[in-house]
Interface confidence: medium
């Protein structure tokens, strides 16, 4: 494949990692909110 596309393989990986990080962050926020709610 040509060089213009080769960076896309990196892009695919980076985007997948970004999305995993966001999902993890959302889970942590939800857990934090649950702890706060439960303590009220």
């Amino acid at each position: 494949d040509n060089p213009s596309l080769s960076i896309d393989l990196t892009f695919h990986l980076l985007r997948t990692l970004l999305e995993l990080a966001r999902t993890q962050s959302q889970r942590e926020r939800a857990e934090q909110n649950r702890i706060i709610f439960d303590s009220v």
């Epitope: 494949d1 596309l5 960076i7 896309d8 695919h12 997948t16 970004l18 966001r22």
Partner: antibody
């Protein structure tokens, strides 16, 4: 040489269906995410749908405007990506472009006209 | 959704002069290593063509009079010396998250 060739466009009545195809060549199709982007006559660009790889379980994503009506799919053995369009509305009238990866390459587009 | 706002909507520049198009995102589209912003050129009757990838990476075969810069929420496409064939509509687009969105477009004409 890389090529993306769309087909399947045409005139359809509101509520009708169409299936667009995009045949790819000149690169390792199975390695890349594929997208559909559309452009209404005289308007700007709107991303429509994306399909990822076998290793991503062929994950799909859609614009809110088409969610539940359009389905993107791919056949890696044929190096082809599809867009099944159901319950078409007049506002779906546009040129539909198939694109590869981060929208690196675009086909010439196929015109979909939804009109009674 | 991330909203991309381009300015100006249209631009007339003399041949050989510099043209600058701006794109502002409603939230950051950058990490410490990558800027998820891209620039396209579209001429009448043709599909868009990728010019700049990841804010500043010139696509293969694109003349080096085109350049891109920026990070976070503010990005710029610059044409250092405008040529007649640069008459087109230019779009920015982000790939930070789903849905990918485009700017409204900037029409560039020769003065």
């Amino acid at each position: 040489e890389m090529q993306l060739v769309e087909s399947g466009g045409g005139l359809v009545k509101p509520g009708g269906s169409l299936r667009l195809s995009c045949a790819a060549s000149g690169f390792t199709f199975s390695n890349y995410w594929m997208n559909w982007v559309r452009q209404a006559p005289g308007k700007g660009l709107e991303w429509v749908a994306e399909i990822r790889l076998k290793s991503n379980n062929y994950a799909t994503h859609y614009a809110e405007s088409v969610k539940g009506r359009f389905t993107i799919s791919r056949d890696d053995s044929k190096s082809t990506v599809y867009l099944q369009m159901n319950s078409l509305k007049t506002e779906d009238t546009a040129v539909y472009y198939c694109t590869v990866g981060t929208l690196v390459y675009w086909g010439q587009g196929t015109l979909v006209t939804v009109s009674s | 959704d991330i909203v991309l706002t381009q300015s100006p909507d249209s631009l007339a520049v003399s041949l050989g002069e510099r043209a600058t198009i701006n794109c502002r995102a409603s939230q950051s589209v950058s990490t410490s290593t990558y800027n998820y912003m891209h620039w396209f050129q579209q001429k009448p009757g043709q599909p868009p063509k990728l010019l700049i990838k990841f804010a500043s990476n010139l696509e293969s075969g694109v003349p080096d009079r085109f350049s891109g810069s920026g990070s976070g929420t503010d990005f710029t496409l610059t044409i250092s010396s405008l040529q007649a064939e640069d008459t087109a509509v230019y779009y920015c687009q982000h790939s930070w998250e789903i849905p990918y969105t485009f700017g409204q477009g900037t029409k560039l004409e020769i003065k």
